[in-house]
Interface confidence: low
């Protein structure tokens, strides 16, 4: 349930097969409508989100993809997207979330007992950004039509992170969004860890603080990919 | 083929109890979440309950928060809804579902007839 | 919780007919929109998601539109199996609800 999350942003809650997937939320991912990807028609600033600059979609976390942020945009600036999840539009397998690949258009799953079922026909639909909004909804939130005055506190339901305290960020839990703490120096965050664990838990931490980013910690450099751990250090 | 088949409805008295079961065949279960949906006679669907993959989250309408807990054994790839504190308003056809995509019920069970009445 | 508001709750049709159905959420919603036809007696049927998108194994004369909070389930040439009950569902936020239904008679 959502207390469960309520106090912090470790990932405590996930079954060993999501554990190590640095919290990152499997085949079910749901990506909110906001900066848009070549195929939308609209496109939403970043509320108090520092958006993570990439070159390539290693750079991403295991639900994210490297994409220009804006419809047709500079292919230099890109960012780190919220991955597709089954059934949306893709035109790379990097876009789909972990446990699905591109085929013909769609996210489909790369496990084929999941459901057994021909793809369903194309639709055109926006790219969306899982770290802001647009026409002020969210894809998964419990937040009701009438806005807070008062900024959320932690565990407070938020659509994005300006509407949460200082000190805080929106970050999702399963088929909401609440108010987490920002991360300090030295937690554990998650970054550059690739596709390949399902699940339908979403227990998303918040990003590093001010002069902070989310880097392998020093002494594992050595550590193999799938057990890299990162946490946020100074730039 | 994607089955599922609901079983445990029957006539309860208001203030009983009563545990429906969904086996799930035709596809990885504990991969997906399930969802409990839920039809009074002559009347429209309504959302009960949702349960994610592994069990570790769970989710409830209002209108059942407190009285009925949703649960899953992937080992039996079985669904599970215990409700207790029956109200003559939870008499209604209750369906299993889940989905390909988390966004729909592609799936949906035959449905079992829950009836408390006295 | 959202609402959602189906029109009209039922109607009369003839085969070959062009039947509509509209939607209405009380907060935007995307399209995150599904429609489902419901048969006595039977489980719900998945019919169109995201608003637009046909359901694998649905015939072509189903389409839906609409974004936001306005949407609409067109039938372009009523068929004597597509007198049913028809339900609109939203999945932008958690819970999911149901539109009341719209019965589709025989005229």
């Known amino acids: 349930t959502l207390n469960s999350v309520l106090n912090s942003n470790a990932i405590k809650n996930l079954p060993p097969p999501l554990g190590g997937a640095a919290g990152h939320p499997g085949s079910a991912v749901s990506a909110a409508p906001g900066i848009l990807y070549p195929g939308g028609n609209k496109y939403q600033t970043i509320d108090n989100y520092q958006p993570y600059p990439c070159a390539e979609d290693e750079e991403c976390g295991t639900d994210e993809y490297c994409a220009s942020p804006t419809r047709g945009g500079d292919a230099g600036v890109q960012i780190c997207l919220a991955c597709r999840k089954r059934r949306k539009r893709c035109m790379r397998h990097a876009m789909c979330c972990p446990g699905n690949y591109c085929k013909n258009g769609i996210c489909v799953s790369s496990d084929q007992n999941h459901f057994r079922g021909e793809i369903e026909e194309t639709i055109t639909e926006s790219f969306g950004n899982d770290h802001s909004t647009l026409d002020g909804y969210s894809r998964r939130t419990t937040l009701s039509s009438k806005m807070y005055h008062t900024k959320g506190q932690e565990g407070s339901v938020c659509l994005r992170s300006s509407d949460c305290a200082s000190g805080l960020c929106c970050a999702r839990h399963f088929w909401s969004k609440i108010c987490k703490p920002v991360l300090k120096e030295g937690q554990v965050c998650t970054k550059h860890r690739r596709k390949g664990s399902h699940g339908l838990e979403i227990f998303q931490r918040c990003y590093c603080g001010e002069g902070l980013s989310c880097r392998i910690q020093k002494d594992h450099h050595q550590a193999s990919n799938s057990s890299r751990l990162h946490t946020c250090q100074r730039h | 083929e994607v089955q599922l088949l609901e079983s445990g409805g029957g006539l309860v008295q208001p203030g009983g109890s009563l545990r429906l079961s969904c086996a799930a065949s035709?596809?990885?279960?504990?991969?997906?979440?399930m969802s409990w949906v839920r039809q009074a006679p002559g009347k429209g669907l309504e959302w009960v309950s949702a349960?994610?993959?592994?069990?570790?989250?769970?989710y409830y309408a209002d209108s059942v928060k407190g009285r009925f807990t949703i649960s899953r054994d992937n080992s039996k790839n079985t669904l599970y809804l215990q409700m207790n504190s029956l109200r003559a308003e939870d008499t209604a056809v209750y369906y299993c579902?889940?989905?390909?995509?988390?966004?729909?019920?592609?799936?949906w069970g035959q449905g079992t007839l829950v009836t408390v009445s006295s | 919780d959202i609402q959602m508001t189906q029109s009209p709750s039922s109607l009369s049709a003839s085969v070959g007919d062009r039947v509509t159905i509209t939607c209405r959420a009380s907060q935007t919603i995307g399209d995150y929109l599904n429609w489902y036809q419901q048969k006595p007696g039977k489980a719900p049927k998945l019919l169109i998601y995201a608003a637009s998108g046909l359901q694998s194994g649905v015939p072509s004369r189903f389409s839906g539109s609409g974004s936001g909070t306005d949407f609409t389930l067109t039938i372009s040439s009523l068929q004597p199996e597509d007198f049913a009950t028809y339900y609109c569902q939203q999945s932008n936020s958690w819970p999911y609800t149901f539109g009341q239904g719209t019965k589709v008679e025989i005229k």
């Open positions: 579902a889940t989905a390909e995509s988390d966004d729909t019920y592609d799936y």
């Open positions: 035709g596809f990885t279960f504990d991969q997906y979440d």
């Open positions: 349960i994610t993959g592994s069990g570790g989250s769970t």
